[in-house]
């Protein structure tokens, strides 16, 4: 080994990474807020939907103040990519009545990537323990029909609101923590 | 500009002990995950044990599990590796490295040898 | 024996393209854990050359490029240059090993 020698900086540290996956979130928030409202317009939904293989929700206002890093990251990406998937599954087995969306659902399946990117990157930097998501039980093949599959939209938009509703709040509370 | 500092290699006898340090500069490294990294002469590099950002995950490449001791004092910005029951296959220079990791030492060689 | 496995060595002439490759399994690459490059010339450190999957530190000129596909990813130099003659190692999160891995390395010869 040589002499010590200095390392520029790299591109962002943890702190810079936790701010990035705040702004990506609320944009994120942003863009499943509208989708949802898009959705409510072309086919007004009758009632909450719901779909077995979406995770549980993680958080509730009352459990905010008790949070710690690793448990929130963790939670959040393998909500997170469970959510990419069923995204992912929607596009595929969207009927055509769901095709007119497709460019937004593409735009939001991207955007999911890089948050879930941003998020594991922080991770890494922080050394924190990153549990391999688990395949999520998605619905095998294609909705039973084009109802079906709407009512899916429904319930993953839905459920992916309320998600990233809860994780502005969890990463803004983490902030002051790192 | 960003600084880690290995120090504490040397040459020790099979079944010895030895106490790797690493002192960090120009950056947050209370904020940072810290690695020990080791290359054998001429092979390849080897994840040997993390520490996450605040000390409170540690884990370790099973090669060194129950030998090696990783801690960190971000008060002192400062990484170590205390090393049990040395073997020769332990000889390598060992990198101290932060983050991904982003930023690596220039290593410090440790020999175990009689 | 490394768990992610690349080629031992690579060549090219300066001004060609090269590609390293860098093979895992369902506990690292393909569990969407992200692959990260490193360089290290010759009697030095490593260095940091691509962070998750394709992004590039500030330094790193352009002509280094990574990609990832299921359980593999590669890492592309463009416009080969003689100061890129360097051992190259990919790196990934292992969620069996519960910290990163690395591949055994590759050796690139600069050629002419």
């Known amino acids: 080994p040589g002499p010590p020698a200095g390392s520029p900086r790299v591109s962002s540290d943890p702190r810079a990474d936790l701010d990035s996956a705040v702004l990506l979130t609320r944009s994120l928030l942003a863009d499943t807020r509208q989708l949802a409202a898009q959705m409510r317009d072309k086919f007004p939904a009758d009632g909450d939907h719901n779909l077995d293989s979406l995770p549980t929700l993680a958080m509730s206002a009352g459990t905010l103040g008790s949070l710690q890093l690793p448990g929130v990251l963790t939670r959040l990406r393998v909500d997170l990519m469970s959510y990419f998937r069923h995204v992912q599954w929607l596009r595929r087995a969207a009927g055509p009545s769901l095709k007119t969306l497709e460019p937004e659902l593409g735009a939001l399946q991207a955007r999911l990537e890089r948050l879930l990117r941003r998020l594991q990157l922080l991770m890494s930097r922080l050394a924190l323990p990153q549990a391999a998501p688990d395949q999520p039980a998605v619905p095998l093949g294609p909705p039973a029909s084009a109802w079906g599959s709407i009512r899916a939209a429904h319930a993953i938009l839905g459920g992916l609101h309320l998600t990233l509703d809860w994780a502005v709040r969890g990463l803004l509370l983490l902030k002051t923590r790192l | 500009e960003v600084q880690l500092l290995e120090s504490g290699g040397g040459l020790v006898q099979p079944g010895g002990s030895l106490r790797l340090s690493c002192a960090a500069s120009?950056?947050?490294?209370?904020?940072?995950?810290m690695h020990w990294v080791r290359q054998a002469p001429g092979k390849g590099l080897e994840w040997v044990a993390v520490?996450?950002?605040?000390?409170?995950?540690?884990y370790y490449a099973d090669s060194v599990k129950g030998r090696f001791t990783i801690s960190r004092d971000n008060s002192k910005n400062t990484l170590y590796l205390q090393m049990n029951s040395l073997r020769a296959e332990d000889t390598a220079v060992y990198y101290c490295?932060?983050?991904?990791?982003?930023?690596w030492g220039q290593g410090t060689l440790v020999t175990v040898s009689s | 024996q490394s768990v992610l496995t690349q080629p031992p060595s690579a060549s090219g002439t300066p001004g060609q393209r090269v590609t390293i490759s860098c093979s895992g399994s369902s506990s690292n690459i393909g569990s969407d854990y992200d692959v990260h490059w490193y360089q290290q010339l010759p009697g030095t450190a490593p260095k940091l050359l691509i962070y998750s999957n394709e992004e590039r530190p500030s330094g790193v000129p352009d002509r280094f490029s990574g990609s990832k596909s299921g359980t593999s990813a590669s890492l592309a130099i463009s416009g080969l240059r003689s100061e890129d003659e360097a051992d190259y190692y990919c790196s990934a999160w292992d969620s069996s090993l519960s910290g990163p891995v690395f591949g055994g390395g590759t050796k690139l010869t600069v050629l002419g």
């Open positions: 490295a932060a983050g991904v990791p982003d930023y």
């Open positions: 520490i996450s950002y605040d000390g409170s995950y540690k």
């Open positions: 120009g950056f947050t490294f209370s904020s940072y995950g």
